[in-house]
């Protein structure tokens, strides 16, 4: 029972994890302008993997989407592959994980390969909560070394009393998002690896074994007649899984600017 | 056809308060802002503030806080500015404008003469 | 507050010249996020509400004519009236549009001869 109640769970806990990767991936705040130096402004940016917008204070947003593949920093390429390799990691683990629930009867389907099922789904939450984790946490990176370098110019003098306020971008909600979908997608595979270890059936094997009497070339197998002492070995086997999932994706160099719409 | 339809000349004795109403038709009220300018004695303009009709948010300009007070009325696709404790500089034209693209002032009443005098 | 300075404050001219006003702000109203200037110019008739007829420093609203150019950038930025028209008689504005409080230059004071 609590085997289910822990795959259950961690298959619940990881569809909220691989839905808020999913959401945060779509979203427009990745990074927001900072208010800090300019609360004043009539004018809101903010930017996402995918596009760039701007929000008018008369309510009118503008989005623009980065038409060019080429032409973007290598690390946002770096945060959109890894947050497309989590989201079908995790999508993929999901479709496992649907046939690997102990409270879904599909066909003579055996408990062992259930837990086969469950550990590979697990291994590929596990997978794809990091890679969440990862690429959220490389563009959050990515945002304070911008906004140090950019606070480094903040002000760039246009001789006399003009000033031009270079715009400085903040963490958005997406990255909160992301963080907190990483890791429930990762507690969730944890959760399905360990109700995949009381998935496993237990085999009680009976090894043959030769008694010798003095005397006698009797040979007497256990739970026979004559020979009913327990010496057979009870040996619980358990299978030994292989979890060597890897991903290599490439650390890239910084951009030189964030701004890259 | 879009319209900003604003209350009458008002005279009133300092001191006093004042509602100015901004009458709307023809757009959604509620998906524009709507802004207050004065004019004073045919010189240059001067916004108030505005409001925004669907949450009913101010953002005011710091020098007219605590003058004026804007509120809209859904129902009736109404915007008003309330001014208190009138003086002599508050005599001036009062104009309601909408907001458009680029937060530029797209619609505009025709304006209501304000004149505060003893 | 952003501060707008209309240059000349009044200019008299004959029908059919070119005229060109300038207003300058005291900080940028360009906008890096969609590389747009928050600058919009007004026309006012003597006796009427104002007339937007430029956004985004460029941008000419609808049914305004094509006569009316409104171009610069950053801190710096030009109204032109390719030819002038004796209904062009009036004040023209210019508004920051990027920053709270939205502040006004004097005006252009277009007088006609």
């Known amino acids: 029972m609590a085997v289910t109640a822990c795959q259950g769970l961690g298959f619940v806990v990881s569809l909220i994890g691989i839905a808020g990767i999913i959401a945060a991936t779509c979203m427009d705040q990745w990074s927001t302008q900072d208010l800090y130096n300019n609360p004043v402004t009539a004018v809101f940016n903010y930017q996402g993997l995918w596009r760039s917008c701007v929000r008018e204070s008369s309510g009118f947003t503008e989005c623009r989407g980065y038409f060019t593949l080429l032409g973007l920093p290598a690390m946002l390429q770096a945060v959109r592959a890894l947050m497309i390799v989590g989201i079908v990691l995790g999508a993929i683990g999901l479709l496992v994980s649907i046939f690997a629930l102990k409270c879904i009867r599909i066909g003579s389907m055996e408990d062992s390969a259930k837990a086969n099922m469950t550990l590979t789904s697990g291994i590929m939450f596990i997978v794809s909560g990091l890679c969440a984790i990862a690429g959220v946490s490389v563009f959050a990176n990515m945002l304070v070394t911008n906004f140090w370098m950019s606070t480094a110019n903040m002000y760039t003098g246009m001789g006399g009393m003009v000033q031009t306020v270079q715009t400085r971008y903040t963490f958005g909600a997406a990255l909160f998002v992301g963080w907190v979908a990483g890791g429930l997608t990762l507690i969730g595979g944890v959760m399905m690896c360990i109700a995949c270890r009381g998935l496993a059936p237990e085999e009680t094997n009976y090894k043959a074994v030769s008694y010798h009497a003095s005397g006698h070339s009797v040979a007497y197998k256990p739970g026979g007649f004559k020979a009913s002492t327990g010496f057979g070995s009870n040996t619980k086997n358990k299978k030994i899984y292989d979890g060597g999932a890897r991903t290599e994706d490439e650390v890239q160099s910084y951009p030189s600017k964030h701004d890259y719409v | 056809e879009f319209q900003l339809q604003q209350s009458g000349p008002e005279l009133e004795k300092p001191g006093a308060s004042v509602r100015i109403s901004c009458k709307t038709s023809g757009y959604s009220f509620t998906g524009y802002n709507m802004n207050w300018v004065k004019q004073s004695n045919g010189e240059s303009l001067e916004w108030i503030g505005n409001?925004?009709?669907?949450?009913?948010?101010?953002r005011y300009n710091q020098k007219f806080k605590g003058k004026a007070t804007l509120t809209v009325d859904k129902s009736s696709s109404t915007a008003y500015m309330q001014l208190k404790s009138l003086t002599s500089e508050d005599s001036a034209v009062y104009y309601c404008?909408?907001?458009?693209?680029?937060?530029?002032?797209?619609?505009w009443g025709q304006g209501t003469t304000l004149t505060v005098s003893s | 507050d952003i501060v707008m300075t209309q240059s000349p404050s009044s200019l008299t001219v004959t029908a059919g010249e070119k005229v060109t006003m300038s207003c300058k702000s005291s900080q940028s109203l360009l906008n890096s996020g969609n590389q747009k200037n928050y600058l919009t110019w007004y026309q006012q008739k003597p006796g009427q509400p104002p007339k937007l007829l430029i956004y985004?420093?460029?941008t000419r609203e609808s049914g305004v004519p094509d006569r009316f150019t409104g171009s610069g950038s950053g801190t710096d930025f030009t109204l032109t009236i390719s030819s002038v028209q004796a209904e062009d008689l009036a004040v023209y504005y210019c508004?920051?549009?990027?920053?709270?409080?939205?502040?006004f230059g004097s005006g252009t004071k277009l007088e006609i001869k």
């Open positions: 985004w420093a460029s």
């Open positions: 409001i925004d009709p669907y949450y009913g948010a101010t």
């Open positions: 508004q920051n549009d990027y920053s709270f409080p939205f502040t």
């Open positions: 404008a909408r907001s458009y693209y680029g937060n530029a002032f797209d619609y």
